[in-house]
């Protein structure tokens, strides 16, 4: 059967298309091409007589068509109007006619798009921005790219106008990015240049650094203030409520106790019209900036449970310090049997119980610094326990609480030779 194949089917304006004829019959007199789905003399493009090899243009001939001896038709410099159907009319030597129709679609070669914006300086959490991909092109698909990636899913992003317009509601600083649009049709794809969205924001609450509060007399006080802001914030400093200077850094050499007080950093963004402040307390004191490592002294380190008491003393040569105690990573005192005295220097446990066995340490600190002692181990022994409270694990004797104590006493080895000998005597 006579058929027409369009190569290609989707043709770009300005390019060419070949209407390729398949299964052309033998013994032909000639053939004619027509624009449309039927033979119509008024729409004849070109006729060809095989015997004379003569091509004759018809009313629909534009000078862009070339007919080949195999009846295929080449159309050059395609225009939008060329879209549609084409009919080949074959006249055989026996004057019997045969027809076939083919078609193709014409699309414009897309121009490079550009992005227009309705707001070049949007303010964070306040403004919306609408980007539009120009120009509007029929039969084109519009795509958007943010930092060269496809659009993220967000309730603040909305596509409209056939995806030609991208709207960002309540812009945030995170929307500051590179935006591109792309136009696509079956014959071409073009991407715009980047448009950088510049979201105005801030200032955020300023941060004053360094974070130190305490300084020694004679030191230099150097404070820096920073607040995230676009455009960058303007800074000013106040000390105890009195304006000092309009700079991001504040420097006071050789400070004295008189420089103690509240230091305020004020950050202002003149474009967004917003301002924020942060207040920092500075204390100038003679207190030692380095606290020495304390030591623990114990009245005894091995005691008998429910009988003995013990005193632990945290020794330090520093003055103006505070002391706190720790046992098994918890601060003390943790029971009524524990008492702190002499400004927390001494920890007394009276009487000592089996649960008091373990590691103790103290920490000395002042507002500027702190230091910890090495730990000390307190061992707690018990006399004459009943046989059923002993268990043998790898030939080591451990105490197992009875009458109300459900858990094995935490890996606290009992130095109890008499009970051990008694245990082995019975096994």
């Amino acid at each position: 059967k006579l058929t027409i194949e369009s190569t290609p089917f989707n043709v770009a304006e300005g390019k060419e298309v070949l209407l390729l004829v398949h299964n052309l019959p033998q013994h032909l007199f000639g053939y004619s091409w027509y624009k449309g789905e039927r033979v119509d003399g008024n729409r004849q493009i070109i006729g060809y007589v095989i015997g004379t090899q003569q091509a004759t243009p018809g009313p629909a001939y534009s000078g862009r068509e070339i007919i080949y001896p195999n009846a295929s038709l080449l159309i050059q410099n395609i225009i939008q109007n060329d879209t549609g159907f084409y009919t080949l009319h074959v006249i055989k030597s026996d004057l019997v006619n045969e027809e076939a129709t083919g078609q193709f679609r014409v699309y414009p070669e897309l121009p490079k798009p550009s992005i227009s914006s309705n707001n070049s300086k949007p303010v964070e959490d306040k403004d919306a921005v609408a980007f539009t991909c120009e120009p509007e092109t029929q039969d084109a698909t519009y795509l958007w790219w943010v930092n060269n990636q496809s659009l993220p899913v967000s309730p603040r992003l909305q596509l409209s106008n056939g995806n030609r317009t991208l709207t960002l509601f309540n812009v945030t600083r995170n929307d500051s990015a590179s935006y591109k649009c792309e136009t696509q049709n079956p014959v071409s794809a073009r991407r715009s240049d980047s448009v950088i969205l510049n979201v105005l924001y801030g200032p955020d609450t300023p941060t004053i650094s360094p974070s130190d509060t305490y300084y020694r007399p004679g030191a230099n006080l150097s404070l820096s203030c920073y607040a995230a802001s676009n455009p960058p914030a303007q800074y000013s400093w106040l000390i105890n409520g009195t304006f000092q200077q309009s700079t991001q850094e504040l420097f006071i050499p050789n400070i004295t106790v008189n420089n103690s007080g509240s230091y305020t950093c004020h950050a202002n963004n003149s474009v967004t019209g917003c301002n924020r402040t942060t207040v920092k307390t500075i204390i100038v004191t003679e207190l030692s900036p380095v606290v020495a490592k304390p030591q623990i002294k114990a009245s005894k380190t091995t005691v008998t449970g429910d009988k003995d008491s013990v005193n632990l003393t945290c020794s330090t040569n520093d003055t103006g310090i505070s002391i706190r105690w720790f046992f098994k990573n918890q601060s003390l005192p943790s029971s009524e049997r524990m008492k702190l005295s002499q400004g927390n220097i001494t920890l007394s446990i009276n009487p000592v119980k089996r649960e008091d066995a373990g590691t103790y340490w103290c920490e000395v600190f002042n507002p500027i610094s702190k230091n910890q002692s090495d730990p000390i181990m307190l061992n707690v022994n018990y006399n004459a326990l009943p046989q059923e409270n002993l268990i043998n694990v790898d030939e080591q004797l451990y105490f197992q609480g009875g009458s109300g104590l459900n858990d094995i006493f935490e890996a606290q080895k009992i130095e109890w030779h008499e009970a051990r000998a008694h245990h082995h005597h019975h096994h």
């Epitope: 300005g14 060419e16 070949l18 070109i46 060809y48 091509a55 004759t56 243009p57 001939y61 534009s62 000078g63 862009r64 070339i66 007919i67 080949y68 080449l74 050059q76 410099n77 225009i79």
Partner: nanobody
Framework: EVQLVESGGGLVQPGGSLRLSCAAS????????IGWVRRAPGKEEELVAD????????RYADSVKGRFTISADTSKNTAYLQMNSLRAEDTAVYYC????????????WGQGTTVTVSS
């Protein structure tokens, strides 16, 4: 009605020059490709040169490269062939034709103009 009318042929001595013109009607030459085809007795038909105004492209047969120049004036809907350094083997009837930019195939031409190169 589509028409191609050639002019400018004549007798010229070897080494001489001629300029052929092809006036087109019934279509715009800016939309298509126009070529010059020559036929000489006992020789194969030859596509000498063509021009596609819409593409801004030109092509030449090896035998005329550097000697012939094809051009088009779309405002006059006319194509030209400037022939320099003519040789005896350039003697032929020159036809203006509508040609394919793809493969140089042509299938509609004018009545032709005769160029004779002889001393």
């Amino acid at each position: 009605e589509v028409q191609l009318v050639e002019s400018g042929g004549g007798l010229v001595q070897p080494g001489g020059s001629l300029r052929l013109s092809c006036a087109a009607s019934g279509f715009n030459i800016k939309d298509t490709c126009i070529g010059w085809v020559r036929r000489a007795p006992g020789k194969e038909e030859e596509l000498v040169a063509d021009i596609c105004p819409y593409k801004g492209s030109t092509r030449y047969a090896d035998s005329v490269k550097g000697r012939f120049t094809i051009s088009a004036d779309t405002s006059k809907n006319t194509a030209y062939l400037q022939m320099n350094s003519l040789r005896a083997e350039d003697t032929a009837v020159y036809y203006c034709a509508i040609v394919s930019a793809r493969d140089g195939y042509y299938n509609y031409w004018g009545q032709g103009t005769t160029v004779t190169v002889s001393s």
